[in-house]
């Protein structure tokens, strides 16, 4: 079974501003899972609706 995501490498510790980096296996690229209260591709924006 191939997992859908992996931990990002150490090189990507600063990839996400307010979130956790996950490496999307099938898309072969990093992505960010934002902490509560943040949005954006890199979790760079405060969620004004939160």
């Amino acid at each position: 079974v191939v997992s859908h995501f992996n931990d990002c490498p150490d090189s990507h510790t600063q990839f996400c501003f307010h979130g956790t980096c996950r490496f999307l296996v099938q898309e072969d690229k990093p992505a960010c899972v934002c902490h509560s209260g943040y949005v954006g591709a890199r979790c760079e924006h405060a969620d004004l609706l939160a």
Epitope: P9, V25, P30
Partner: antibody, heavy 115, light 106 residues
Framework: VQLQQSGAELVRPGASVKLSCTAS????????MHWMKQRPEQGLEWIGR????????KYAPKFQDKATITADTSSNTAYLQLSSLTSEDTAVYYC?????????WGQGTTLTVSS | IQMTQSSSSLSVSLGDRVTITCKAS??????LAWYQQKPGNAPRLLIS???NLKTGVPSRFSGSASGKDYTLSITSLQTEDVATYYC?????????FGGGTKLEIK
């Protein structure tokens, strides 16, 4: 899906040069873009990388004062500028982006520094 | 992170099974690539993620991982496989490369 680099350069010592690397088939904003150096008959060295989404850069210490990496997301292109050129900068320069399943390298740009 | 290829050159015969090894100084969690380079040419990416064969690379090439040890295998060496092979870690920056293993025909 590929990385296409600019053509060979012959430049004078002391000058600067700007090399380009244009991506097709993927968005350079999705991940970091890296640059490598390979001198004749030698191994590969990492110069540095850029996060094209925000311009954040990181360099190997030995290239800190030599290289400047930039990116233009509108043209999906990363650049490597090398300054104060000497014969030590004569090399082939490669751009790259690496994933777990796939990886992409440009074909290389040969830089010759000679008077 | 240091990447050590224990053999700088290997003397091989056509048809041989060839194994090239690479050891990382720390755990790199399979963020490893293998390249083939022939004189005057750019490095050719063979494998990424330690085991994932790039499209178009012959199936006689394979990669494996065990802890900090990584292996590139060629099941039956062909003339066109005579080249220098490099490993590379991309777990962290600076990316680092092994010193290369040059295959030479006996």
């Amino acid at each position: 899906v590929q990385l296409q680099q600019s053509g060979a350069e012959l430049v004078r010592p002391g000058a600067s040069v700007k090399l380009s690397c244009t991506a097709s088939g993927f968005n350079i904003k999705d991940d970091y873009m890296h640059w490598m150096k390979q001198r004749p008959e030698q191994g590969l060295e990492w110069i540095g990388r850029i996060d094209p989404a925000n311009g954040n850069t990181k360099y190997a210490p030995k290239f800190q004062d030599k290289a400047t990496i930039t990116a233009d997301t509108s043209s999906n292109t990363a650049y490597l500028q090398l300054s104060s050129l000497t014969s030590e900068d004569t090399a082939v320069y490669y751009c790259s982006r690496m994933g777990l399943l796939r990886g992409y390298w440009g074909q290389g740009t040969t830089l010759t520094v000679s008077s | 992170i240091q990447m050590t290829q224990s053999s700088s050159s290997l003397s091989v015969s056509l048809g041989d099974r060839v194994t090239i090894t690479c050891k990382a100084s720390v755990h790199i969690n399979s963020w490893l690539a293998w390249y083939q380079q022939k004189p005057g040419n750019a490095p050719r990416l063979l494998i990424s993620g330690a085991t994932n064969l790039k499209t178009g690379v012959p199936s006689r090439f394979s990669g494996s991982a065990s802890g900090k040890d990584y292996t590139l295998s060629i099941t039956s060496l062909q003339t066109e496989d005579v080249a220098t092979y490099y490993c590379q870690q991309y777990w962290d920056t600076p990316w680092t490369f092994g010193g290369g293993t040059k295959l030479e025909i006996k």
